[in-house]
């Protein structure tokens, strides 16, 4: 599959992930800052990464979880909901050695983690602590609990057009 980025030809290749939708044909930047694929007409904004009909933005700046949520909202997106092993692997492969906030929150009264779309996450979150109610990915192969008030990078997600 082809994953769009800032390379000269508008796309770069990455390892194949079995269930990733294949994108065929050449791609070209358009005047409005979007990059299109001729085959399926899917579009991600410049500097966003394409994966399975979704667009992902990995920031270089850092902020708290609340500020990260607002940052993504301002880009017409949400913090990433990383709810499959394939999606996690894809994002791990394109993250630098940094921590990135995602859309996963610990609901203390329920004693469970939920995605920001309210679906339950049944899985492994390391580094859990009574003060760590947010989660990051990037440095380990799993999700890490983190303080919501500390500044980290963030991953935003939205539908490809």
């Amino acid at each position: 599959p082809q994953i769009f980025n800032k390379s000269n030809d508008g796309f770069t290749t990455t390892r194949s992930y079995g269930t990733v939708s294949q994108i065929f044909g050449s791609s070209s930047p358009s005047p409005n800052g979007f990059i299109t694929t001729r085959s399926y007409g899917t579009v991600c904004p410049k500097d966003w990464e394409f994966y399975q009909a979704r667009c992902f933005f990995l920031s270089t700046s850092e902020s708290s979880w609340n500020e990260s949520r607002d940052f993504c909202k301002g880009k017409g997106s949400t913090l990433a909901i990383v709810n499959t092993p394939e999606k996690l692997k894809f994002l791990q492969d394109i993250t630098d050695a940094e921590k990135y906030f995602i859309g996963l929150i610990y609901h203390r009264e329920e004693k469970r983690w939920r995605w920001i779309n309210n679906s339950v996450f049944n899985g492994n979150v390391t580094n859990q602590n009574q003060n760590f109610n947010c989660a990051t990915i990037g440095l380990t192969k799993t999700f890490d609990a983190a303080s919501c008030d500390i500044s980290y990078r963030r991953i935003c997600e939205k539908n490809a057009k």
Epitope: Y17, G18, P85, N122, N124, T142
Partner: antibody
Framework: QIQLVQSGPELKKPGETVKISCKAS????????MNWVKQAPGKGLEWMGW????????TYADDFKGRFAFSLETSASTAYLQINNLKNEDMATYFC??????????????WGQGTALTVSS | DIQMTQSPSSLSASLGERVSLTCRAS??????LNWLQQEPDGTIKRLIY???NLDSGVPKRFSGSRSGSDYSLTISSLESEDFVHYYC?????????FGSGTKLEIK
Amino acid sequence: QIQLVQSGPELKKPGETVKISCKASGYTFTIYAMNWVKQAPGKGLEWMGWINTDTGEPTYADDFKGRFAFSLETSASTAYLQINNLKNEDMATYFCARSSEVFYDYRFDYWGQGTALTVSS
Amino acid sequence: DIQMTQSPSSLSASLGERVSLTCRASQDIGSSLNWLQQEPDGTIKRLIYATSNLDSGVPKRFSGSRSGSDYSLTISSLESEDFVHYYCLQYASSPFTFGSGTKLEIK
């Protein structure tokens, strides 16, 4: 579609070695761990352990330390179970089963069809 | 190790009947429990994951629930293909452990 296809039945003598394969298709092999499960004739299921398909690191349940070895051929999307110095009590059907370490909803979600091992002198 | 006590070990029931199988966990496993179905040819299929979630393609007559440390698989109206073996599996902590199984027989 996702499939785990195991090698065929085996007939071995005590003291011999057997190597059972589990070939995965329909997904990216290295994203999911592979478990091995034993079922002795007329008995229930017993977890033997698992192998991290990304790093190749195996984890064995206490009863399966020593003569048992999990291995991989990543390029062929295949996991292996090897049993050395076979004993009569190894006679069983062995299953492979896929799992995610991180996402519990994907634990033991797909199973191989099983490989019957007969140990007889 | 966590023990999973499954009951009954065998159950005779009639077509169309509603039945429940139970597994009791010796320690807290949260919702980390699967129900598995094993056909006479040995084929194993996951029916329920995370206590109560139905796998895709599994008929809606199957359901899973929890009450404290007791986990149940209920089949609302038995069909002929349901008369096979069922196992629970906890994956909350290693070593992962199975119930001893229930053989569902036609009356």
